[in-house]
Interface confidence: medium
């Protein structure tokens, strides 16, 4: 988790002088509770936005937006803590909006936004906005949280972001798998425009199960430049086992930008359909 490398993060708007600061996610008001605390944020919205760094790289970011409730507690609102928790790693990153002037009611509802948390493809986050100061231990909570799922690199807009392109998202191998006689599969795919090796991993499963009954790995050496974008054909030998009939073919490239962690593409061959057995015709017709 990190912040987009923007020049200066701003949270000021007409009628409010505000600065964005790094936060330890442990605001001072936890340790020194205040008697009067503001109410919670209203209408917290999280959306996927895209932003360029100063170097021109494009990253997915969490666009966080919320409004204030129209009650007198805004007189005690000193700022907000924004927290993003990546759910699979428990990594957390926080920033703090520090209000340098007192808020006053005006004719429009106060609205705040922040779009500088960089998020990763295919990850889920919990976004929390805490109004500051935080409540006393038994006080009403004054935060709002929402979960936010970032699409993977198959998503059209995500595909062209720097992290997705670095993991090989622009490569479309267009895998075809053909079943041959004598327990073999012919796998065909399009090579990318990089002189790097690939590996094909074949995993076979019984008809209705997810425990593999066979695995095979085939290495494809780095193509020469004249072979870029050409089709590569490989014949794989299957295990001669009647029930081991559903095959997943996975192609893993080793592009220089992602090495062992490039996006893998896969295709599946289902077990052959069992012909429906016709109902037996009885020798006699019952009379009732």
């Amino acid at each position: 988790l990190r912040l987009l490398d923007h020049r200066a993060l701003v949270c000021s708007q007409p009628g409010l002088n505000c600065t964005v600061k790094n936060s330890t996610c442990l605001d001072d008001s936890w340790i020194h509770p205040r008697n009067l605390t503001p109410s919670s944020p209203k209408d917290l919205q999280i959306q996927l936005h895209f932003a360029h760094t100063q170097q021109g790289d494009l990253f997915p970011v969490a666009h966080i937006e919320w409004t204030l409730q129209t009650d007198a507690s805004i007189l005690y609102l000193e700022g907000a803590e924004l927290s993003v928790l990546q759910l699979n790693t428990n990594e957390r990153l926080c920033v703090r909006f520090e209000f340098l002037s007192k808020l006053r009611h005006h004719h429009r509802r106060w609205r705040f936004t922040f779009s500088h948390f960089v998020v990763d493809p295919d990850q889920e986050y919990e976004v929390t906005v805490h109004h500051l100061p935080k409540p006393i231990p038994d006080g009403d909570p004054n935060h709002q949280s929402k979960n936010f799922l970032v699409p993977d690199c198959e998503h059209a807009r995500m595909k062209v972001t720097t992290p997705c392109m670095s993991s090989g998202s622009l490569w479309d191998p267009n895998i075809t798998v053909e079943t041959l006689e004598a327990h073999q599969l012919r796998v065909s795919f399009t090579l990318w425009n990089e002189s790097t090796h690939y590996q094909i991993l074949l995993t076979s499963f019984p008809h209705m199960e997810n425990h593999s009954c066979f695995e095979h790995m085939h290495h494809i050496p780095a193509p020469r430049p004249e072979e870029f974008h050409q089709r590569s054909n490989v014949t794989l030998t299957l295990r001669n086992l009647k029930g081991c009939c559903r095959h997943q073919v996975q192609i893993q490239p080793f592009f220089s930008s992602c090495l062992n962690d490039c996006l893998r593409h896969s295709a599946t061959v289902s077990c052959p359909e069992m012909p429906d057995t016709p109902e037996p015709i009885p020798d006699y017709m019952p009379l009732w």
């Epitope: 590996q199 991993l201 995993t203 593999s212 009954c213 066979f214 695995e215 095979h216 790995m217 030998t237 295990r239 893993q252 062992n260 962690d261």
Partner: nanobody, 115 residues
Framework: EVQLVESGGGLVQAGGSLKLSCAAS????????MAWYRQAPGKQRDFVAT???????NYADSVKGRFTISRDNTENTMYLQMNSLKPEDTAVYYC?????????WGQGTQVTVSS
């Protein structure tokens, strides 16, 4: 999760032989394809050879005819017999299960071929 421990490396003269072993723990070994990789100083980790549970093998062009990969499913062990070694075979050799390729690697075993 599979744990892999490589052994058998050492210093050998050009033209000599070594046999590497890879001991695997974890129930996924028996049906899994296994592979050897190597990483020379300052270079990317490269594929060497692979073997599936039926004994089907596949080799990098640079080692074909000189290296032989084998496995013992009952002992959960894979081997790499390296003959006619050349100085360019000097590297740290690693074993892995291709389906776990992006996970943590073992320590590897150092093979040094002197001329």
């Amino acid at each position: 999760e599979v744990q892999l421990v490589e052994s058998g490396g050492g210093l050998v003269q050009a033209g000599g032989s070594l046999k590497l072993s890879c001991a695997a723990s974890g129930s996924t070994f028996r049906g899994a394809a296994m592979a050897w990789y190597r990483q020379a100083p300052g270079k990317q980790r490269d594929f060497v050879a692979t073997i599936d549970s039926l004994g089907n093998t596949n080799y990098a062009d640079s080692v074909k005819g000189r290296f032989t990969i084998s496995r013992d499913n009952t002992e959960n062990t894979m081997y790499l017999q390296m003959n006619s070694l050349k100085p360019e075979d000097t590297a740290v050799y690693y074993c892995n299960v291709p389906r776990f390729i992006s996970r943590a690697w073992g320590q590897g075993t150092q093979v040094t071929v002197s001329s």
